[in-house]
């Protein structure tokens, strides 16, 4: 999917996908403007599925995607939990 | 610091369930992207992972022996645990309790417990 | 399940030796590999992750490397402290799978 490491700018990403992360199994987005030491946007998806990717900040069906989430009302109801026990 | 350490029986029989637990500290399974994990290694073969459990309860566990694992934890205690049913003498192996931590970059099983050795044996 | 075919399964070799370990994967696994270093009577440890980025104080002469579905490790000269077992592990997806091993013994 990518590489990542700690390095010296500070950034979690060293690459990133494009390829698109389905809206239903994304459980948090972490949008990091520069700062810190880090002079690029990160984007950092956890996945339900128990995973954690680093994602192209300027891919387009990011950019649909971070609009849906932030029209979305903060008091809208939360998805039903997917099922708990997994043959993995 | 963060340690991790094994402890169930050192010998049981054929049939029986095999106990484990996980004692930890220098982490908690409460915050978002904490988890505990299981994998085992019989004498001088290859490693196994047997089952995962997350701060949210999220269980794993390897398809290839489901029927037979349950993992589970207490939060409040530090404590993660796997039961295995109905053990037969190719259950014997060292078992490790491991960490993973939801971060990116992602390295699961980044710490690892000392191991704690099981025999099956009639 | 994704397999991953480690070889060789053991192997001897001489203080100052380069030596490389592969791992094949039954399928695409983009990176996600671990490489980790089981010294005799301890607990494995990470040693390479995401296939190519040194662990927190793994020596400079440990690296990893991607060819398609190959991925290898690499000791670029041999010391004695790196006598162990060598483990690959794809966390792409459930169930993580390991390699079979590696020991690496002194010639």
């Known amino acids: 999917i990518l590489e990542a490491h700690y390095t010296n700018l500070k950034c979690r990403c060293s690459g990133v996908i494009s390829t698109v992360v389905g809206l239903n199994i994304i459980d948090r987005i972490q949008v990091t403007p520069p700062g810190n030491g880090c002079p690029k946007t990160e984007v950092v998806i956890w996945t339900k599925m128990k995973k954690v990717i680093c994602v192209n900040p300027r891919a387009k069906w990011l950019q649909r995607l971070l609009r849906h989430v932030q029209s979305k009302s903060l008091s809208s109801t939360p998805q039903a939990p997917v099922s708990k026990r997994r043959a993995a | 610091q963060v340690t991790l350490k094994e402890s169930g029986p050192e010998i049981l029989q054929p049939s029986q369930t095999l106990s484990l637990t996980c004692t930890f500290s220098g982490f908690s399974l409460s915050p978002y992207g904490m988890g505990v994990g299981w994998i085992r290694q019989p004498s001088g073969k290859g490693l196994e992972w047997l089952a995962n459990?997350?701060?949210?309860?999220?269980?794993y566990y390897n398809p290839s022996l489901i029927n037979r694992l349950t993992i589970s934890k207490d939060t409040s205690n530090n404590q993660a645990f796997l039961k295995i049913t109905n053990v037969d003498t190719t259950d014997s192996a060292t078992y490790y309790c491991?960490?993973?931590?939801?971060?990116?970059?992602?390295?699961?099983?980044?710490?690892w417990g000392q191991g704690v050795m099981v025999t099956v044996s009639s | 399940d994704i397999q991953m075919t480690q070889s060789p399964s053991s192997m001897s070799a001489s203080l100052g030796d380069r030596v490389t370990i592969t791992c094949q994967a039954s399928?695409?696994?983009?990176?996600?590999l671990i490489w980790f270093q089981q010294k005799p009577g301890k607990s494995p440890r990470p040693l390479i992750y995401?296939?190519?980025n040194l662990a927190n104080g793994v020596p400079s002469r440990f690296s990893g490397r991607r060819s398609e579905s190959n991925y290898s490790l690499t000791i670029s000269s041999l010391e004695s402290e790196d006598m162990a077992d060598y483990h690959c592990?794809?966390?792409?997806?459930?169930?993580?799978?390991f390699g079979a091993g590696t020991k690496l013994e002194l010639k």
């Open positions: 399928q695409d696994i983009e990176n996600d």
């Open positions: 592990l794809q966390f792409k997806q459930y169930p993580y799978t």
């Open positions: 459990i997350w701060w949210d309860d999220d269980k």
């Open positions: 491991v960490r993973s931590e939801l971060v990116m970059p992602y390295v699961p099983f980044d710490y």
């Open positions: 995401y296939a190519t």
